[in-house]
Interface confidence: medium
């Protein structure tokens, strides 16, 4: 029994996948799939705008922290890097790059320094920064 | 133009990836898949010899570190893990769970335990640790 | 370059106050997060307080909880400690030292001494 | 007694090896970055060692910093008479909601 086909275009072979595997996907060529979530970390440091830019020059976006079980793989990411979170001064709420509120729980807001803008660490923390300062950061395409 | 062709055999339905996006695996359910390895780390710390197990008994094998390119992903992960690598007291040389020698410049090797088993750390470096010790640990399966 | 100058350490009595102050030069004073860190003479490095940028965040070691206050002068690019109910055992220099979100204490200044003795 | 766990001291030959342990808790140490601090005789604390094992710059690549689980350790290498000093480690504390540091190590190079 197989869970999926997967149709090989170049030599029209079939390949079998077990029930217990899957493919995941589709991502950008060398991104990181997990859950059907594509990531990737930029190494180069920019400004929180830079990397907004970045991200969506590859049909992306700055990281969206939506459910700690569907993104686990974030607690073991070490160091400092932006992602899409914004504050948006007329009302003090935090949203992401989509216009959605952060949802409460989902980060731990370290509002230390002063800034609009929210670097992604380890454990779910969320730090604040001036959007203005140079750090790496990590892009994130939803698939379909 | 499509790079590849999915069939989905539950729906029938061919989906069409642009030539920038490619599928990743296949992969067991819910790991990481990265340049077609698949990744899972897992929580529970265990020792050396269970960690091989559980590996093992997922159709994988402790984390091998062969490649600083393909397996980038691995220069930002937090923590320590068991990886595959093993110390042969004979010839004094660090192997691989199957059997390959572990190649210069790959990881930094850092003796900070007496022991025969390895831990890796981020940016490539791999701590001595006695083989006993429970820590988390990686696994991976290599696709075909 | 960013510069810290501890100052307002002396000899007090014991229950009496102290304030100290912390100058700080050569960066955006408004934008980062402030400490107090001391030690006793002789001893290791004991962690104070935090105040947020703009001190709406404050978080105190639990033994100086109640009797210290720290504050800070956005205008003034300075921090303040404000030290009431002293008792001996706060005898020590006490640095301030800038936070960084990535580096923690990148910064340190030089320390004024405070010597509580009747 | 201070929340991390430091031995209070080390001493080792000039060219050699030393190693500092740093103990902690889950809520310290096990789910924050750790720092390390070195402070010459009569003198402030310098950073020496950030988000585990991260060097400043201007910091020599003698030193190196690790952390697993809930311990932490500072390592020098090619000991100099400079590096005799106190050594710190550092956590912020999520229970106690502050800093906390270790009780120092006291490096003599002999």
């Known amino acids: 029994i197989w869970s999926a086909v997967f149709l090989n275009s170049l030599f029209n072979q079939e390949v079998q996948i077990p029930l217990t595997e899957s493919y995941c996907g589709p991502c950008p060529k060398n991104w990181i799939c997990y859950k059907n979530n594509c990531y990737q970390f930029f190494d180069e440091s920019k400004n929180w705008y830079e990397s907004q830019a970045s991200c969506m020059s590859q049909n992306a976006s700055l990281l969206k922290v939506y459910s700690k079980e569907d993104q686990d793989l974030l607690k073991l990411v070490k160091s400092y890097h932006w992602m899409g979170l914004v504050h948006i001064p007329t009302n003090g709420s935090w949203q992401w790059e989509d216009g959605s509120i952060l949802s409460p729980n989902l980060l731990t807001i370290i509002e230390m320094q002063k800034g609009d803008c929210a670097l992604y660490a380890s454990s779910f923390k969320g730090y604040i920064e001036n959007c203005s300062t140079p750090n790496t950061y990590i892009c994130m395409q939803r698939t379909v | 133009i499509w790079s590849a062709v999915f069939l989905n055999s539950l729906f029938n339905q061919e989906v069409q990836i642009p030539l920038t996006e490619s599928y990743c695996g296949p992969c067991p359910k819910n790991w990481i898949c990265y340049k077609n390895n698949c990744y899972q780390f897992f929580d529970e710390s265990k020792n050396w010899y269970e960690s091989q197990a559980s590996c093992m008994s997922q159709n994988a094998s402790l984390l091998k570190v062969y490649s600083k390119e393909d397996q980038d992903l691995l220069k930002l992960v937090k923590s320590y893990h068991w990886m595959g690598l093993v110390h042969i007291p004979t010839n004094g040389s660090w192997q691989w769970e199957d059997g390959s020698i572990l190649s210069p410049n790959l990881l930094t090797i850092i003796e900070m335990q007496k022991g025969d088993c390895a831990l890796y750390a981020s940016s490539f470096k791999g701590y001595i640790e006695n083989c006993s010790t429970p820590n988390t640990y990686i696994c991976m399966q290599r696709t075909v | 370059q960013v510069q810290l100058v501890e100052s307002g350490g002396g000899v007090v009595q014991p229950g009496r106050s102290l304030r100290l102050s912390c100058a700080a030069s050569?960066?955006?004073?408004?934008?980062?997060?402030m400490h107090w860190v001391r030690q006793a003479p002789g001893k290791g490095l004991e962690w104070v307080a935090v105040i947020s940028y703009d001190g709406s965040n404050k978080y105190y070691a639990d033994s100086v909880k109640g009797r210290f206050t720290i504050s800070r002068d956005n205008s003034k690019n300075t921090l303040y400690l404000q030290m009431n109910s002293l008792r001996a055992e706060d005898t020590a220099v006490y640095y301030c030292?800038?936070?960084?979100?990535?580096?923690?204490?990148?910064?340190w200044g030089q320390g004024t001494l405070v010597t509580v003795s009747s | 007694q201070s929340v991390l766990t430091q031995p209070p001291s080390v001493s080792e030959a000039p060219r050699q090896r030393v190693t500092i342990s740093c103990s902690g808790s889950s809520s310290n140490i096990g789910n924050n970055a750790v720092n390390w601090y070195q402070q010459l005789p009569g003198k402030a604390p310098k950073l020496l060692i950030y988000?585990?094992?991260l060097l400043p710059s201007g910091v020599s690549d003698r030193f190196s910093g690790s952390k697993s689980g809930t311990s932490a350790s500072l390592a020098i290498s090619g000991l100099q008479s400079e590096d005799e000093a106190d050594y710190y480690c550092a956590a912020w504390d999520d229970s106690l909601n502050g800093y906390v540091f270790g009780g120092g190590t006291k490096l003599t190079v002999l």
């Open positions: 030292a800038r936070y960084d979100n990535t580096r923690i204490f990148d910064y």
């Open positions: 050569g960066f955006t004073f408004s934008s980062y997060a």
């Open positions: 988000y585990d094992d």
